[in-house]
Amino acid sequence: MRTEAQVPALQPPEPGLEGAMGHRTLVLPWVLLTLCVTAGTPEVWVQVRMEATELSSFTIRCGFLGSGSISLVTVSWGGPNGAGGTTLAVLHPERGIRQWAPARQARWETQSSISLILEGSGASSPCANTTFCCKFASFPEGSWEACGSLPPSSDPGLSAPPTPAPILRADLAGILGVSGVLLFGCVYLLHLLRRHKHRPAPRLQPSRTSPQAPRARAWAPSQASQAALHVPYATINTSCRPATLDTAHPHGGPSWWASLPTHAAHRPQGPAAWASTPIPARGSFVSVENGLYAQAGERPPHTGPGLTLFPDPRGPRAMEGPLGVR
């Protein structure tokens, strides 16, 4: 969801507000309020289930929690698509499905979730610790990807939402640190608002900031699965074919990781019939990648009529993986 972090221009404070509630003190609550209000970002959840009937058969379900419209979903295994992963299926909401062995049946479950059944025979069949990733390209959010795998100990037939890998990366510490600061800021803001609720509110002028200025993309652990720590692209190493990466690097680059964290999780939007997607409690190993804003001079890939894709930091072929785009 693209939001604008614009701090409203303030009129000079009322005479009674000089002193303790000075200009600097007034600006801070508005900055924090804007951050708190615009702090919601989309998320992707992934659920991996081993079928009780066929021990080597898997069902992968993925969903997008965001208000945008999905333009493409790519499911891969062995790590994120474009970072060592192999594409299993590409699903377009209007144009259909391309799938690859061992995918048996890919399909849309709702407007914002898909499922993929993998068959369990042959050299390319998955095993219990294979990592599966789902990448959602959406408008206007950009590209968001999450990965998950079935814990080796899970009982067949039971839904075993993936748990994060035990790999904490340096960037994560930074993200959590900033999350803490923002959380503290929001609490402080509430405190300020309570303290000063009897004072007159400052008059706002229309902002002179360009409405086109994009806010920095943000990431943080979601409330949708509070008990689980969401590790960006930390995948579980597997002995299965294809080999996965111990750590798949975030595609957005270091500059992306310097952006602000968020706390609000978005619920699926749209008709009620589509909104019944069960969100796996606690188990979604959620990580995100933002490919929304093109770098200067970067040309968006040709998508043809009706297909809206956004530039991926890795270039025009990244969106489709092995399904090459010109």
Partner: antibody, heavy 119, light 107 residues
């Protein structure tokens, strides 16, 4: 000019195998999937399966699993389809076609290879 | 598998007429339907993709419409070179399936 050139007609005995080739030119071979389609005499078209030359991933119509095997040779920009355990039911024209993954359709078709199975 | 039904096996028309060829999917396939033309003794050629988009070089006499389960290929101002078989194809789900074809005859 983008072209797919298929090998010539095949006359085969029941129980034997044939391998049809499809040579691509005029574009980067690994940028597009190659799909195969069967057309029996006087009948409609049947989709056999697809191969991604980029990584050899395949997807088969369940009906043709065990009958058709799709492979590629990147060095010669050629896709192959092997048909085994041939019966008279396999007598047909087989087409290779290029899948445009930008626009999601078969944008280029080869001229086809006629396979006749007869004892 | 999704079944694509082209109920008219043959259609007869005259040069200059307008003709509509229909295709019905056994389930909702959104706009994941293409139309292909196969002239006698030739391989199929793309006409329309994603229900309504014309392939490069296809005359604007050919138009596609529909979504969900009902699709139509309309040829207006029919020409003698339009004598051919016309097939619809769905790629909403694997395996992709073609309609049985409609043979257009010019009176």
């Amino acid at each position: 000019e983008v072209q797919l050139q298929q090998s010539g007609p095949e006359l085969a005995k029941p129980g034997s195998s044939v391998k049809i080739s499809c040579k691509a030119s005029g574009y980067t071979f690994t940028d597009y999937n190659i799909d195969w389609v069967k057309q029996s005499h006087g009948k409609s078209l049947e989709w056999i399966g697809a191969i991604d030359p980029n990584n050899d991933s395949t997807n088969y119509n369940q009906k043709f699993k065990g009958k058709a095997t799709l492979t590629v040779d990147k060095s010669s920009s050629t896709a192959y389809m092997e048909l085994r355990s041939l019966t008279s039911e396999d007598s047909a024209v087989y087409y290779c076609t290029r899948w445009d993954s930008d626009d999601w359709y078969f944008d280029v078709w080869a001229t086809g290879t006629t396979v006749t199975v007869s004892s | 598998d999704i079944v694509m039904t082209q109920s008219q096996k043959f259609m007869s028309t005259s040069v200059g007429d307008r003709v509509s060829i229909t295709c019905k999917a056994s389930q909702n396939v959104r706009s994941a339907v293409d139309w292909y033309q196969q002239k006698p003794g030739q391989s199929p050629k793309a006409l329309i993709f994603s229900s309504s988009n014309r392939h490069t070089g296809v005359p604007d006499r050919f138009t596609g419409s529909g979504s969900g389960t009902d699709f139509t290929l309309t040829i207006r101002n029919v020409q003698s070179e339009d004598l051919a078989d016309y097939f619809c194809l769905q790629h909403w789900n694997s395996p992709y399936t073609f309609g049985g074809g409609t043979k257009l005859e010019i009176r």
